[in-house]
């Protein structure tokens, strides 16, 4: 009774198509299936960014495989065979590993790289990202910005620079078609006639840096003598009510009286005859039932009431 | 397998120069950054400077004058040279492959002494 | 340039138990940048320890090492007779890359 035994994939590789962080990984069928041309081979594919405790893990009958990495890092990423039970009369059959690394061998040292960078979404409109030059850097240093998302052909480069002093400080994206909701990759390289400047990578998803425009048009109403509603509507732009979640400062004659944290444009104020004044200011920030994450907006201009009787009127600015 | 292999003379007469050759194996020059590091026991480890795959260098300021680096990919071959040698200079040489921003394989090292 | 102290610069220990090795760095260092090293006597130094806690390929898993900032620890859980060495930190952050001077593990 022979033991059952397979053998790793072939030419097993990392490719880099110049997407910036999204890698194929690909491999051949093993040598000799021919004896189980009746079976449907299955490959386990697991793979890391160096220095990761974890390993994702794929189980796949085709023989490539896609995925976003950090390119500041190395790859590895290992394969076998899985014959599954039905083709070996018992327990499944694995081949031994099949192994492969990638990484981009770096030029410079890791000071010259970009600092700070920060990218953020405008009002899920505008895509602006900036950063400062490496530590020691020359000023005849100059900073690159490619980028790629799925969709696109290839990556792109910058071409609307902020600059400071001559060097590029920053990027003024273009409108980006059809670029939330996926992995949107940049890469800054550097150049300098003093010395090599390193690459950097980043990767992120638009709808989770999106800082929006401050809610708009606050009121004050009446709703019964110990409350007040107060309301505001949404800034302009392509982003949802359903998106939004706000927080609310409101000041009672000059103290803090509540913050508080909205999913509703309106909020209801307990408030005492004896209130003077009262001011109120509201920010907004997309909620977790559109993105992962959101940058708070700046505080809305604030709207006041003072000098009457609260509890005789609506206000209405 | 990876392997570095530094050559050189062991000794160097005062204020003359010192040229290292680091031959390597296993791995292309074309893909892998070169360091260069010294070790002596008044002084410990020292970096003196790295070739990268593309052939660019960075120095250590404190020795940028002194020092020259570069290589030859097709014969596998880092080329290390230092002017102007004083006793302090005498030390044990390294020449180690970069990886990961890491020294991950190091030649066994090449003792120069520098003495009249 | 960035120094780092290694504490202490010798230290003696009995086979089994645990010991640790600090790095101080006098300014902050990226956790991804902070090396530690194995060199034993006529041998060239060996990477033992990456990214601050990442084993280099094979070393044992009683090493360990964490830290961040300008704290940095290598510790080793019930000492063997084969980790005499000297151990050192390393920094790949800023120029000029910059080790430590060293610590002696001595077994008693």
């Known amino acids: 009774d022979t033991e059952i035994k397979v053998n790793p994939p072939q030419d097993f590789e990392i490719v880099d198509p110049g997407y910036l962080g999204y890698l194929y990984l690909q491999w051949q069928p093993p040598l000799s299936l021919d004896h189980f041309k009746e079976c449907t081979v299955e490959y386990e594919l697991k793979y890391r960014n160096i220095g990761s405790e974890t390993w994702k893990t794929i189980i796949t009958k085709n023989l490539h495989y896609k995925d976003g990495f950090d390119l500041n890092k190395g790859i590895e990423a290992k394969i076998h065979t899985l014959l599954p039970w039905q083709c070996t009369n018992g327990s499944e059959v694995q081949s031994s590993w099949a192994e492969t690394t990638y990484w981009i061998s770096p030029q410079g040292i890791p000071e010259t790289k970009v600092q700070d960078m920060d990218c953020v979404y405008y009002n899920w409109q505008y895509l602006l990202c900036s950063w400062k030059p490496g530590i020691g850097v020359l000023l005849d240093t100059n900073y690159n910005l490619f980028y790629w998302y799925e969709g696109l052909d290839h990556a792109l480069q910058c071409v609307d620079y902020i600059k400071a002093d001559g060097q590029n400080i920053g990027c003024r994206f273009p409108y980006l078609e059809a670029s939330d909701y996926k992995d949107f990759y940049i890469c800054v390289n550097g150049s300098s006639e003093n010395k090599p400047i390193r690459s950097s990578y980043f990767t992120f998803q638009l709808q989770n840096i999106v800082k929006p425009l401050p809610p708009v048009y606050l009121t004050f109403t009446r709703e019964s003598s110990c409350e007040i509603k107060l309301k505001w509507s949404i800034p302009l732009g392509p982003i949802p009510a359903r998106c939004f979640d706000y927080e609310i400062e409101i000041r009672e004659d000059d103290t803090t009286l509540v913050t508080a944290t909205v999913e509703n444009e309106t909020y209801t104020l307990k408030t005492t005859n004896e209130t003077r004044q009262l001011c109120f200011v509201v920010r907004s920030k997309v909620n977790i039932y559109c993105s992962d994450d959101g940058i708070w907006s700046e505080w809305s201009d604030k709207q006041c009431w003072e000098g009457e009787d609260l509890s005789k009127k609506t206000l209405l600015r | 397998q990876v392997q570095l292999q530094e050559s050189g003379p062991g000794l160097v007469r005062p204020s003359q120069s010192l040229s290292l050759t680091c031959t390597v194996s296993g791995f292309s020059l074309t893909s892998y950054g070169v360091h260069w590091v010294r070790q002596s026991p008044g002084r410990g480890l020292e970096w003196l400077g790295v070739?990268?795959?593309?052939?660019?260098?960075d120095y250590n300021a404190a020795f940028i004058s002194r020092v020259t680096m570069s290589k030859d990919n097709s014969k596998n071959q880092v080329f290390f040279r230092m002017n102007s040698l004083q006793a302090n200079d005498t030390a044990v040489y390294y020449c180690?492959?970069?990886?990961?921003?890491?020294?991950?394989?190091w030649g066994q090292g090449t003792t120069v002494t520098v003495s009249s | 340039e960035i120094v780092l102290t290694q504490s202490p610069s010798i230290l003696s220990a009995s086979v089994g138990e645990d010991v640790t090795i600090t790095c101080t760095a006098s300014?902050?260092?990226?956790?991804?940048?902070l090396h530690w090293y194995q060199q034993k006597p006529g041998s060239a130094p060996k990477l033992w320890i990456y990214?601050?806690?990442n084993l280099a390929s094979g070393v044992p898993s009683r090493f360990s090492g964490s830290g961040s900032g300008t704290s940095f620890t290598l510790t080793i859980s019930s000492l063997q007779a084969e980790d005499a060495a000297t151990y050192y930190c390393h920094q790949y952050h800023r120029s000029p890359l910059t080790f430590g001077a060293g610590t002696k593990l001595e077994i008693k």
């Open positions: 180690a492959r970069d990886r990961y921003d890491a020294f991950d394989y």
């Open positions: 990214s601050t806690s």
């Open positions: 300014s902050s260092v990226s956790s991804s940048y």
């Open positions: 070739i990268w795959s593309g052939g660019s260098t």
